[in-house]
Amino acid sequence: LEASEEVELEPCLAPSMEQQEQELTVALGQPVRLCCGRAERGGHWYKEGSRLAPAGRVRGWRGRLEIASFLPEDAGRYLCLARASMIVLQNVTLTIDDSLTSSNDDEDPQSHRDSSNGHIYPQQAPYWTHPQRMEKKLHAVPAGNTVKFRCPAAGNPTPTIRWLKDGQAFHGENRIGGIRLRHQHWSLVMESVVPSDRGTYTCLVENAVGSIRYNYLLDVLERSPHRPILQAGLPANTTAVVGSDVELLCKVYSDAQPHIQWLKHIVINGSSFGADGFPYVQVLKTADINSSEVEVLYLRNVSAEDAGEYTCLAGNSIGLSYQSAWLTVLPEEDLTWTAATPEARYTDKLEFRHDSGLNDIFEAQKIEWHE
């Protein structure tokens, strides 16, 4: 949107039963007019739960939301509710777009004129435009990760941002890999963090009227080797109808390169277990974590034979982890019965101690898992 344009959703239309959700960015000083319904039959506008009065700088009137000149405090969520049913007809979030107002050092220091349309906006000290993006104050990240701090702000004239580390000006010149500063995004990025990056990072945002600052704390966690961690509850017990498709999901977390196998427990000569007590299994899928979709097992057009226990086995150079789930396959006529029956929950998690290398892990299957 150019700053000279008026923000307008659409000409006033009869209320739609489908909820309309929009986010609009508006320049400071810009007029806003949003329509919801037609004239007297239009809905009522609310901001943050309070109904807007029909008069004033910001008003809800005859189905219209009208803001004479958009100010920072006007940012937020606006709802238009149908008069009788209170159905949400419009759900609009207005956010500040400060990119449309840029400072010019030659201008009157007491005010700011937008070069695109001649509007004069009052001076304003810096303020945070997206405080929700600054809620995470403490960043505790593993070594080698990327870290991003941001302090999105606005003001008039447009403020500048600079960064401090532990109270000292920070330009990243002593940091291996340097830093990335994006002033338009009000962000500082450090890639491949190391323990020496720990500290307090301060963004300092200032203009001629005032300044604001915010502190972030960075802790860099040195990696400790461990066998793969599998997300609890996955794979999940699943009930499916004959002929349907099934997806079993296994989420694996591992610093060391993990390898994943999907196994189906089978019966051999009437037995599910070998003489050594380990189950008989069939390997359905195997790959490393970088392979697309290895963490998902797809079973297409399932039949009664597909029912049974499935295991996600993940191993790395430190050890093995695995979790199992049951697939129940019902004939189509049992579909209604399934919907009314609570699903029994069973997740088996066994952990092996393994000191041998990665190749030995899956070689060990010959001992621990019978195929």
């Epitope: 400060d98 990119s99 449309l100 840029s102 995470k136 990240v141 002033h183 338009q184 995004h185």
Partner: antibody, heavy 119, light 107 residues
């Protein structure tokens, strides 16, 4: 309305050079960061490079670092991508895209221009 | 660089189905994730930005959720015009990597 129009694509031999342009209209060009994104035939999207609205910040994908240069001329509302030492794997449709304010979401895209690197 | 992994790589669905596509980042990327739709021979179109914000003009049947490493794009009731390829893209790190794409086909 916002429009982005790429040009400059074509057939070039390996090791050759090409300069892509992206003419922008319908918005205040200098207020927005711009990116190049490419797509090899039958493949997915690959981000190539970004430049801040005032040209103060640039960044490149590892695959093109040292060979490609992104630049802009705000007086002409034009974004450029200078591509040197071209390789067969650079064959793709190249899109220019505008970044949303405060975010790095590409809210407007050009129609793309095809670059073919072949002997 | 931060890797983005989408699943599934393709899926078949019918008009009216609820469709879910997932995207996983190789590290925490906060909510710095966008979703795009691309139809053959066309440029991509922004659907969702910053994980959960619906881009202006995009139908409300599209929604996004997630933060950290795991993200989801949901189409609540698939329409004929929704058959396309969908991509996630992270913008937490300076190199804005895309997922490999998910093709949504007609069953």
């Amino acid at each position: 309305q916002v429009q982005l129009l790429e040009s400059g694509g074509g057939l070039v031999q390996p090791g050759g050079s090409l300069r892509l342009s992206c003419a922008a209209s319908g918005f205040t060009f200098s207020d927005y960061a711009m990116s190049w994104v490419r797509q090899a035939p039958g493949k997915g999207l690959e981000w190539v490079s970004v430049i801040e609205g005032d040209g103060s910040y640039t960044h490149y994908a590892d695959s093109v670092k040292g060979r490609f240069t992104i630049s802009r001329d705000n007086s002409k509302n034009t974004l450029y991508l200078q591509m040197n030492s071209l390789r067969a794997e650079d064959t793709a449709v190249y899109y220019c895209a505008r970044e949303k304010t405060y975010s790095s979401a590409f809210d407007y895209w050009g129609q793309g221009t095809l670059v073919t690197v072949s002997s | 660089d931060i890797q983005m992994t989408q699943s599934p790589s393709s899926l078949s669905a019918s008009v009216g189905d609820r469709v879910t596509i997932t995207c996983r980042a190789s590290q925490d990327i906060s909510s710095d994730l966008n979703w795009y739709q691309q139809k053959p021979g066309k440029a991509p179109k922004l659907l969702i930005y910053d994980a959960s914000n619906l881009q202006s003009g995009v139908p409300s049947r599209f929604s996004g959720s997630g933060s950290g490493t795991d993200f989801t794009l949901t189409i609540s009731s698939l329409q004929p015009e929704d058959f396309a390829v969908y991509y996630c893209q992270q913008h937490y790190s300076p190199s804005h990597t895309f997922g490999q794409g998910t093709k949504v086909e007609i069953k």
